[in-house]
């Protein structure tokens, strides 16, 4: 935010930039939560953008019996890998595909027991207040399908009729991550000094972080014809003289008409 | 991925006979191989398969009449087809499991990479 200065007075003003605001030759630059001329007022609104997605990690181990182990699986680059990935990849893509958060599967480390596979399931969703809730879903699904699959497709009598055959047993769901985001928190935090004052309002679904003298939410503070300013006290109406009115109080809702005929003062609430 | 590529089709007179081939271009000792055929308008459908230890299956319509095998050396696969029949019109692809694909005793899924196939036609 920044604010240009022409003439004279310029080099007084580079000395009075406030708020950390810096001097660059024309005009105050001002740190984010600040603008005017002299970086003097304090924004209304912070942009906290959410992310578009949300993203979860599950670690998962299962234990693959329709693949015999060999010590190349655990090179990464040997084609025993690759191979094996191709198969497991499409095989999970299978089991999860009525998921819509399902992003894919990733291959941590395979071992002896059979194929032990240790593995994350990728989950994403777009960006909700309810992501949570979502995402929570999402992992209680996928650790529904695992263990449906890992219980249905075995080896029966030595044979695996299916692309992969599992051992029941070996299903265990070690670790759940989900990215976290939380916009109060990041509001607060982006406010500084003004942490109190500043709230997040939902539009579309979509987080806000205002203070009341950001005009059009629930929490806007309406100073009628006066301006709304914050200070560390809070948000304060500052009043406005017009040529026919002084006006007043807490929110320049009274109004004093300047009477130049009678000389006294008339009240208009 | 394995590379597989089949050979020696033809056409053929019922009863007759015809050996295919399958090139592979990679080992195929610890692969469970199989044959398959389409015939057109038809669904793809398992002819034999074969363990990577030697262990063969036949699918009913075609059991002993064929016959599979492999040639670790050289990396070949082979189906040796005796008394045929019109019905078995067909084209002819030959296919591969990952390596060290165990239980290999189904016609189905466990073969994931395929090849071009050879068209084998018997007239009556």
């Known amino acids: 935010r920044t604010t240009t200065c022409f003439g004279d007075g310029c080099q007084n003003t580079a000395s009075r930039c406030k708020n950390g605001g810096t001097w660059d030759g024309l005009k105050c630059q001002c740190p984010n939560l600040y603008y005017g001329e002299l970086c003097e007022e304090v924004v209304s609104s912070i942009d906290i953008g959410p992310p578009e997605t949300i993203s979860a990690q599950m670690e998962l181990t299962v234990t693959v019996t329709s693949v015999k182990f060999t010590e190349e699986l655990k090179n990464h680059s040997s084609q025993e890998f690759q191979e094996f990935k191709q198969t497991f990849t499409e095989q999970m893509n299978i089991v999860y595909s009525g998921i819509p958060e399902y992003v894919g599967v990733n291959i941590t480390k395979l071992r002896l027991g059979s194929v032990v596979v240790e593995h994350d399931v990728l989950l994403r969703t777009k960006y909700t207040p309810e992501y949570k809730t979502v995402l929570d879903n999402a992992t209680e699904v996928v650790k529904e399908k695992i263990t449906k699959v890992t219980t249905q497709q075995i080896m029966i009598n030595d044979i695996c009729s299916d692309m992969m055959c599992f051992n029941t047993t070996g299903t265990q769901v070690q670790n759940i991550t989900v990215t976290q985001y939380d916009p109060e928190e990041d509001c607060r935090k982006m406010a500084k000094e003004y942490g109190d004052y500043f709230v997040v309002e939902y539009r579309d679904q979509k987080p806000y972080c205002i203070s009341p003298c950001e005009p059009g939410f629930s929490v806007s503070k309406n100073c009628n014809l006066g301006k709304c300013q914050m200070s560390l006290s809070g948000p304060q109406c500052l009043c406005v003289t017009t040529e026919t009115h002084w006006y007043s109080g807490e929110t320049c809702n009274q109004g004093t008409q300047k009477s130049l005929v009678y000389g006294h003062h008339h009240h208009h609430h | 991925d394995v590379q597989l590529q089949a050979s020696g089709g033809g056409a053929v007179q019922a009863g007759g006979s015809l050996r295919l081939s399958c090139a592979a271009s990679?080992?195929?000792?610890?692969?469970?191989m199989g044959w398959f055929r389409q015939a057109p308008g038809k669904e793809r459908e398992g002819v034999a398969g074969?363990?990577?230890?030697?262990?063969?299956i036949y699918a009913d319509s075609v059991k002993g009449r064929f016959t599979i095998s492999k040639d670790n050396a050289k990396n070949s696969l082979y189906l040796q087809m005796n008394s045929l029949a019109p019905e078995d019109t067909a084209n002819y692809s030959c296919a591969a499991s990952i390596l060290n694909r165990v239980g290999c005793r189904q016609l189905s899924y466990e073969y994931i990479y395929r090849g071009q196939g050879t068209q084998v036609t018997v007239s009556s």
């Open positions: 990679g080992d195929i000792t610890r692969r469970c």
């Open positions: 074969i363990s990577e230890d030697g262990i063969t």
